[in-house]
Amino acid sequence: LPLNSSTSLEKNNVLFGERYLEKFYGLEINKLPVTKMKYSGNLMKEKIQEMQHFLGLKVTGQLDTSTLEMMHAPRCGVPDVHHFREMPGGPVWRKHYITYRINNYTPDMNREDVDYAIRKAFQVWSNVTPLKFSKINTGMADILVVFARGAHGDFHAFDGKGGILAHAFGPGSGIGGDAHFDEDEFWTTHSGGTNLFLTAVHEIGHSLGLGHSSDPKAVMFPTYKYVDINTFRLSADDIRGIQSLYGDPKENQRLPNPDNSEPALCDPNLSFDAVTTVGNKIFFFKDRFFWLKVSERPKTSVNLISSLWPTLPSGIEAAYEIEARNQVFLFKDDKYWLISNLRPEPNYPKSIHSFGFPNFVKKIDAAVFNPRFYRTYFFVDNQYWRYDERRQMMDPGYPKLITKNFQGIGPKIDAVFYSKNKYYYFFQGSNQFEYDFLLQRITKTLKSNSWFGC
């Protein structure tokens, strides 16, 4: 149960928790029984776990002190459950020159300070992308910056001081891209009140198509925390996210190994996002690319994912093959695609939850099919699930800890594939482990790129 006793304070906490989870994690309050305190709590508990998991709290399923504290923290109004990288539907601006207009100014700050804070916030994103932003003072801008209080012309009214600080809409026409700041906050240039620059960097991230990140160091983390604006920098997670949408700055501004430049195959620090066999080949996925290794041959070739499968996204996170069916399953965020005979099947992507994962699972780190048992192993954070491909359902008793059942592997893995009828090859960062699943132990430790003769 999320809560056991029914004091008025705890009742208030439950109601507050429900509203928070409805707003940011999609809890369907209509599905909760009227007698909430007697309610067994599965729906609520699952959403609490989902929130705790996303925001890096201890996953208890209870409305404990740290969870309630986090729920009361000032934050962005955009929901959390759409996994990081892009907003649902994946909108991006289809151009590199983007205009913005400041519709009205908060009385809390000098106009020049507002202009400066907003300009610097856009600059944060233009520094790491090919995007160029220019301010216009009249006419229709792509991104409208608005200070408003309460109900203000969308479905998402502000809530007074504290709570929701701002929200923004992903790229698109009309309201698309617009960033709204709650005028009931006290906006500042410093650490007092709410810092406009820091909030604007976050909201512009949404305006460009990013969703929330579960990395507490990321500017796209949902809650507000002041950091020194003079030393402020985007996290690696933020940069990876925005560059997956727009690429990196061109020519002389090039970043080291951005998402859209081909990674060096023999870089000793190279890691992979996903690896799977496809017939007698091995596919190694990284960012927008995959390498193709034909078994027992030294030659490898690099390709864009989009050149083979134009409808698939970059940044594939997990993959597995069922060779007997000529099927390959590819995963990104909470969606998966089915490839049959190297062709994408129609009516995909579909939700990973159709496999039977609980709602707090938002992405798969790695997956592997074992044809001997006709089971697929799904690795998520430090746990794994086992799925019966014949019965099309999860085996009971899962998830289990990776470290408990795969000796020497874990706690988390990046990728895994099955080969030679007895080995799993686990990838963790730049390391790879050959694991004999019959002996249940590691038989070799290799570099991740050892398959390429590096």
Epitope: V81, P88, G89, P91, F169, G174
Partner: antibody, heavy 122, light 103 residues
Framework: EVQLLESGGGLVQPGGSLRLSCAAS????????MHWVRQAPGKGLEWVSY????????HYADSVKGRFTISRDNSKNTLYLQMNSLRAEDTAVYYC???????????????WGRGTLVTVSS | DIQMTQSPSSLSASVGDRVTITCRAN??????LNWYQQKPGKAPKLLIY???SLQSGVPSRFSGSGSGTDFTLTISSLQPEDFATYYC?????FGQGTKLEIK
């Protein structure tokens, strides 16, 4: 071609219940917010409810809050409106409408169904 | 709460006329205003979104303008098929409608 087809309307007594359905085709249903809008005979349009792409996020007009429940089944490309404790003033043609956006609704309806008539009368 | 007031509530005009319908919000809604056309027994059809953007497939004789609290829908030269009811809307709020009839 985008198509929305409502069904489930009919005559119901005050206090009764009805479940409306809206079958969607011609677009990726699971990517978009969906809405119900109603129109009483000879009157204007009234927004009723909306639901987010995954089914989690719902909003209701004050006039139906606590009585109506919006839901969706993305595997069937179908939107639903469960209407309980119906009143005479709920008599209207109910339209389902597709939002132009797939995240954080703007309430801009680019496609509408033909509507289904709900009559609440004893 | 935001309210939308449309005027006039009805209007008689002739083919070829220039017609203007106005919509006023009781507080600023920036450019978040849309216009719909509805013919008897039919579903509404989106004409203009974001105050002035023409929805694809809508004839260019329809135009929208305004921002903040005051908005207008203009039909530059009325055609027989334009006689209908017009609604302004933002988020979950519709204006009460303007019925455009043949004079």
């Amino acid at each position: 071609e985008v198509q929305l087809l409502e069904s489930g309307g009919g005559l119901v007594q005050p206090g009764g219940s009805l479940r409306l359905s809206c079958a969607a085709s011609g677009f990726t249903f699971s990517d978009y917010n969906m809405h119900w809008v109603r129109q009483a005979p000879g009157k204007g349009l009234e927004w009723v409810s909306y639901i987010g792409p995954s089914g989690g996020y719902t909003h209701y007009a004050d006039s139906v809050k606590g009585r109506f429940t919006i839901s969706r089944d993305n595997s069937k490309n179908t939107l639903y409106l469960q209407m309980n404790s119906l009143r005479a003033e709920d008599t209207a043609v109910y339209y389902c409408a597709k939002d132009i956006r797939g995240a954080y609704s703007s309430g801009l309806f680019d496609y509408w169904g033909r509507g289904t008539l709900v009559t609440v009368s004893s | 709460d935001i309210q939308m007031t449309q005027s006039p509530s009805s209007l008689s005009a002739s083919v070829g006329d220039r017609v203007t319908i106005t919509c006023r919000a009781n507080q600023s809604i920036y450019t978040y205003l849309n216009w719909y056309q509805q013919k008897p027994g039919k579903a509404p059809k989106l004409l203009i979104y974001a105050a002035s953007s023409l929805q694809s497939g809508v004839p260019s004789r329809f135009s929208g303008s305004g921002s903040g609290t005051d908005f207008t829908l203009t039909i530059s030269s009325l055609q027989p098929e334009d006689f209908a009811t017009y609604y302004c809307q933002q988020a979950g709020i519709f204006g009460q409608g303007t019925k455009l009839e043949i004079k």
